[in-house]
Each structure stands twice: as C-alpha cells, then as structure tokens.
C-alpha cells in the first residue's frame, strides 16, 4: 500500500480524506490510528460512531475529528491546531470485529509557520486558507506521493 504524504502548517488544520469501496466496506466502522515505529502497532486515535448508521456524525478525540460518508465511501479526518508532535505515520482503517484493514497510510508532515521563521523564503499561504486538504496540489504545502487514493486492496 502506497503512503500518501500530506503537509500542514503548524497551528492550522489538516484535513485527510481516505476513499474506499463503499459496498465492500458496508457496515464497517472506520478508525484513524498512529503507527508506532516502522513495524510497530497502530495506536487508535479516534474511530467513527459506534452505530454505523450514525457514522456521518463527527467524533472527536482531543484535536482529532473523524466522520464517514458511508455512501460516497470517504472517511474524513481533521487534525486541528496542528503541532510539531502530530507529525508521523498514520493509517485510515476499516474495522470488522477485531480485524482492522488498512485503507490508506498517511505520512503527516508539519511545517513551521513562515511568519515565525526568518528563513521561510517565499512560501505564501492565502489568508483565508485555514485548512489544508490532502491532494490539494495547488498549494505548495500539500503533496502526494500517490495522487489518487486507490480502492483498498
């Protein structure tokens, strides 16, 4: 499974969208977890509503919010008030009982606010942009190794 690299600005929000085959994963809750080390376990950060029908409702754990559009097959995770400590490798998962199937691996990189850094160069972020979205390549602060999110394998 390819890893998608997403960059966000410290202090702002980063939105991650993981797409999946809606019918294949019908009835399954989704989760966002943080990988501990290269081969280590993935520590659950937040998961969608316990009642699958209500998965569209936002569930929050600290500064991380998750919601699932089960018809469209898109689970959205928002990391609010991004901090340097949020950088790392994460997974979107589809849950079936005790089994967690990886939908997408996401490497989150946190950029320092250029206003706080004299060496930030000419990096320009529109004033109204308070949220970065994965696959939004028009901003130089967001890039994908894999531009499309393929259906889960």
């Amino acid at each position: 499974l390819n890893t998608t690299v997403l960059q966000g600005m410290a202090g702002q929000s980063l939105r991650v969208s993981c797409t999946y085959d809606a019918l294949k994963h019908w009835g399954r809750r989704k989760a966002w977890c943080r990988q501990l080390g290269e081969e280590g376990p993935c520590q659950r950060v937040v998961s969608t509503h316990g009642v699958w029908l209500l998965a569209f409702l936002k569930k929050r754990n600290g500064s991380t919010v998750i919601a699932d559009d089960t018809l469209a097959g898109t689970v959205t995770i928002t990391l609010k008030n991004l901090q340097a400590g949020d950088a790392g490798l994460y997974q979107c998962q589809s849950l079936r009982g005790r089994e967690a199937e990886v939908l997408q691996k996401v490497l989150v990189e946190v950029l320092e606010d250029p206003l706080d850094d004299q060496d930030a160069g000419d990096l320009w972020v529109p004033e109204e942009s308070s949220s970065f979205e994965g696959a939004q390549v028009e901003h130089s602060t967001s890039r994908n190794q894999e531009t499309s999110f393929p259906p889960t394998s």
Epitope: D21, L23, K24, G27, W52, L53, E99, T152, S153
Partner: antibody, heavy 122, light 107 residues
Framework: EVQLVQSGAEVKKPGESLKISCKGS????????IAWVRQMPGKGLEWMGI????????RYSPSFQGQVTISADKSISTAFLKWSSLKASDTAMYFC???????????????WGQGTTVTVSS | DIQMTQSPSSLSASVGDRVTITCRAS??????LGWYQQKPGNAPKRLIY???SLPSGVPSRFSGSGSGPEFTLTISSLQPEDFATYYC?????????FGQGTKVEIT
C-alpha cells in the same frame, strides 16, 4: 430476481482436482461478498471463506486455509471453489451465499445457491 | 475464533407452541448475528438479520432479540412448515461461525 446458481453434482476419486462454480444474476455481482459454506452428511453448517469479486479480496476460515482456493471472475459474475487434491472427507454439500447489504449495515447471508453435492470415493 | 454455542440441540414441539432457541457468543459481536432455517435437501434461508430485523417475506411469527453475548430466536406460534433445523451465524469477525444447529421436531 436475485439468484445464485451453482454447478451440478460431482463424483470424484481421491487425489483428483475439482472446481465448482456459483453464478450470480439479478444484481451487481462485483459489489457483494460471496461466502462458501460446507455441510457434511448429517452435520451442521461450516463457514469456509468469503470473497469480494470486485477486487478478489479473500478471507478463509483457518480450518479451510490451504485446503481449498476461493476465486471469482467478475466478468462472468461467477465465484469458484477449487480443490487441488480431493480427500474422502471432502464429501459434502457446498453452498455459496451472498452477504446482504441492509440500511443498518451488513445483513448476513441473504441469498443462497441451491448447493453442489461433492462425492469423493475410490 | 468466536464460538457460537446454540441450545438446545433439538426440541420436540406441537403446532401452536411457542419455541425459543438461544445462541451465545464466546465474545462480543455487537448485533452482527443472523438466524437461518434449513429443511432437509434445501439450502438455508435467512430468517433474521442484525439480531432482530425481519427480512421481507419472512412471517412475523419469527422474531429475534438480544445483543452482546446472548441472542434468541422465537417462533410465537409454531406452524407445520416450521419443522426444520435452525442455525445462528455471527458475522462480526472472521472467521464467521455458525451455531451447531437446533432441530425442531413434531411431538
């Protein structure tokens, strides 16, 4: 009408190979998981494994892992169950069944094939 | 694997009787449980899904209840065509597992 139609009864000798089929119609075959279930003579139902024809993602029961191969060809809306070397203990009725999709989530096995009798005897 | 313990393994009843069959899961399976009826020589038929939901076409005398480890199938008034074998199936975790079956016979 949603249907799963299985291939006919088979009589085989130990050591022979066999592939039985399950053809779906009346619905989008690639979008529903298909399970295989064994029923030995006079016994209960045993879940063997399941496949998602859309991408051939397959899960097996540990009891059947390595004993059979589950596959699917979405272009002909058909799932398959294959043995490379049959044993007398494989004598049973085999059912395919579709995992249902309900508003509240998955609905178990909602549509079943009529079953394929496999007899393995020397 | 999750074990499904079904009881009783068989029972004798008369037409009009109320019949209850129980399935107990060895661990939590939420409401990911179905009930199936099988008559000799036929494929199983789904009676209940999501522990308590009745598919269209299934008579209302069949009902399911329970959550967590214990689930129940009830036939409120047994009819001649209900004499068959009944199975529960958990589809919460792989591998899915069936109960051992309950054969309902005529007294």
């Amino acid at each position: 009408e949603v249907q799963l139609v299985q291939s006919g009864a088979e009589v085989k000798k130990p050591g022979e190979s066999l592939k039985i089929s399950c053809k779906g119609s009346g619905y989008s075959f690639p979008s529903y998981w298909i399970a295989w279930v064994r029923q030995m003579p006079g016994k209960g139902l045993e879940w063997m494994g399941i496949i998602y024809p859309g991408d051939s993602d397959t899960r097996y029961s540990p009891s059947f892992q390595g004993q059979v191969t589950i596959s699917a060809d979405k272009s002909i809306s058909t799932a398959f169950l294959k043995w490379s070397s049959l044993k007398a203990s494989d004598t049973a009725m085999y059912f395919c069944a579709r995992q249902g999709i309900e508003v509240t989530g998955t609905g178990g096995l909602d549509v079943w094939g009529q079953g394929t009798t496999v007899t393995v005897s020397s | 694997d999750i074990q499904m313990t079904q009881s009783p393994s068989s029972l004798s009843a008369s037409v009009g009787d109320r019949v209850t069959i129980t399935c107990r899961a060895s661990q939590g399976i939420r409401n990911d449980l179905g009930w199936y009826q099988q008559k000799p020589g036929n494929a199983p038929k789904r009676l209940i899904y999501a522990a308590s939901s009745l598919p269209s076409g299934v008579p209302s005398r069949f009902s399911g209840s329970g959550s967590g480890p214990e689930f129940t199938l009830t036939i409120s008034s047994l009819q001649p065509e209900d004499f068959a074998t009944y199975y529960c199936l958990q589809h919460n975790s792989y591998p899915w597992t069936f109960g051992q079956g309950t054969k309902v016979e005529i007294t």
